[in-house]
């Protein structure tokens, strides 16, 4: 009998209101044994996958998706989903990213699609572990 997969959670560091040109990291969390985390933007057709999964805690694994320099176009709704063989989970709740004008900040540079996605380092040693890739579904349209 297949196990029921818990819904993933999503959060953002340092928060969900980000000044233009600053960085943000989306954190997706799920159970032990996740192969792939996917960060979806607005709809299921736009997403980024990573198989670089960390051991977040005794009962959880996580992946981190970083946008190095937030643009106005990055504002919107984000959610996570994960693949734990042999199936995909339900989606997390949506998280809304708001981008605000930074007073006197530098202009936001243009970035290539997908060029700035990625998790940042966690200080805890047992978060350093990685995960094997799953077979991927749809062709990704990069989020960033």
């Amino acid at each position: 009998q297949e196990e029921d997969l818990p819904r993933p959670s999503i959060s953002a560091e340092p928060g969900t209101v980000i000044p233009l040109g600053s960085h943000v990291t989306f954190v997706c969390r799920g159970p032990v044994g996740v192969q792939t985390f996917r960060l979806e933007r607005d709809s299921r057709s736009t997403y980024n996958d990573t198989e670089d999964v960390s051991q977040a805690s005794p009962s959880e694994s996580e992946a981190r998706f970083r946008i190095d320099s937030v643009r106005e176009g990055n504002a919107g709704l984000y959610r996570c989903i994960y693949y734990k063989p042999p199936k995909w989970s339900e989606q997390s709740d949506y998280l809304e990213l708001l981008v605000k004008e930074s007073s006197g900040g530098p202009d936001s540079p243009d970035t290539e699609p997908g060029s700035s996605a990625g998790p940042t380092q966690r200080p805890s040693d047992n978060s350093h572990n990685e995960h094997a890739p799953a077979s991927q579904g749809l062709k990704a349209e990069h989020l960033y």
Epitope: D52, R64, P119, H131, A132
Partner: antibody
Framework: EVQLVESGGGLVQPGGSLKLSCAAS????????MYWVRQAPGKGLEWVAR??????????YYAASVKGRFTISRDDSKNTLYLQMNSLKTEDTAVYYC??????????WGQGTLVTVSS | DIQMTQSPSSLSASLGDRVTITCKAS??????LAWYQQKPGKAPRLLIS???SLETGVPSRFSGSGSGTDYTFTISSLQPEDIATYYC?????????FGGGTRLEIK
């Protein structure tokens, strides 16, 4: 089909250097963590180094036995993993495997390349 | 570093036998345990991850169990092609560490 093909092994004198390469194909290289694992002749397995994906800022980690002497790197545009080995010691003699990782476990292995450190 | 103590280091069994290998971690590894099979002159092959999850294509006669610090690998009915060396490995924390291996032979 996942393929990992190591090259660059050979005979080197103690104190010498060698650079191993691993050509990867059949999977999305740039979203995977990659590892080197070695096995001395007739001995068990030892994790050597790992490099995370760009999404983890290409963070690197090393076994204490090689830290400061070995450097793991990757070129995502070439789907290639590297291991630069400096100040080699006789105890570094081993078959070196390039491995596509899981979250710390080792899902797919290359055929290995033999490094012999001897005078 | 987490030490992995695997036993026995070698064992001899008959075809059809049930074979059990144990691996004990020096601290809790929260089921972050993998098992590998290695045949002479070949690279290791991942059989099991997360203590119990059988990899795709691995025969169902192989199984894993355990939690905390104590883990077990079982072959329910030994086949000729199972003759190999088996390793456990923890991936809860770096440095990732392997057990010393168990060499399995036919009696």
């Amino acid at each position: 089909e996942v393929q990992l093909v190591e090259s660059g092994g050979g005979l080197v004198q103690p104190g010498g250097s060698l650079k191993l390469s691993c050509a990867a194909s059949g999977f999305t290289f740039n979203t995977n963590a990659m590892y080197w694992v070695r096995q001395a002749p007739g001995k068990g397995l030892e994790w050597v180094a790992r490099i995370r994906s760009k999404s983890s800022n290409y963070a690197t980690y090393y076994a204490a036995s090689v830290k400061g002497r070995f450097t793991i790197s990757r070129d995502d545009s070439k789907n290639t993993l590297y291991l630069q080995m400096n100040s080699l010691k006789t105890e570094d003699t081993a078959v070196y495997y390039c491995v596509r990782g899981g979250s710390g476990f080792f899902a797919y292995w290359g055929q290995g390349t033999l490094v012999t450190v001897s005078s | 570093d987490i030490q992995m103590t695997q036993s026995p280091s070698s064992l001899s069994a008959s075809l059809g036998d049930r074979v059990t290998i144990t691996c004990k971690a020096s601290e809790d590894i929260y089921i972050r345990l993998a098992w590998y099979q290695q045949k002479p002159g070949k690279a290791p092959r991942l059989l099991i991850s997360t203590a119990t999850s059988l990899e795709t294509g691995v025969p169902s006669r192989f199984s894993g169990s355990g939690s905390g610090t104590d883990y077990t690998f079982t072959i329910s009915s030994l086949q000729p092609e199972d003759i190999a060396t088996y390793y456990c490995q923890q991936y809860w924390s770096t440095p990732y560490t392997f057990g010393g291996g168990t060499r399995l032979e036919i009696k």
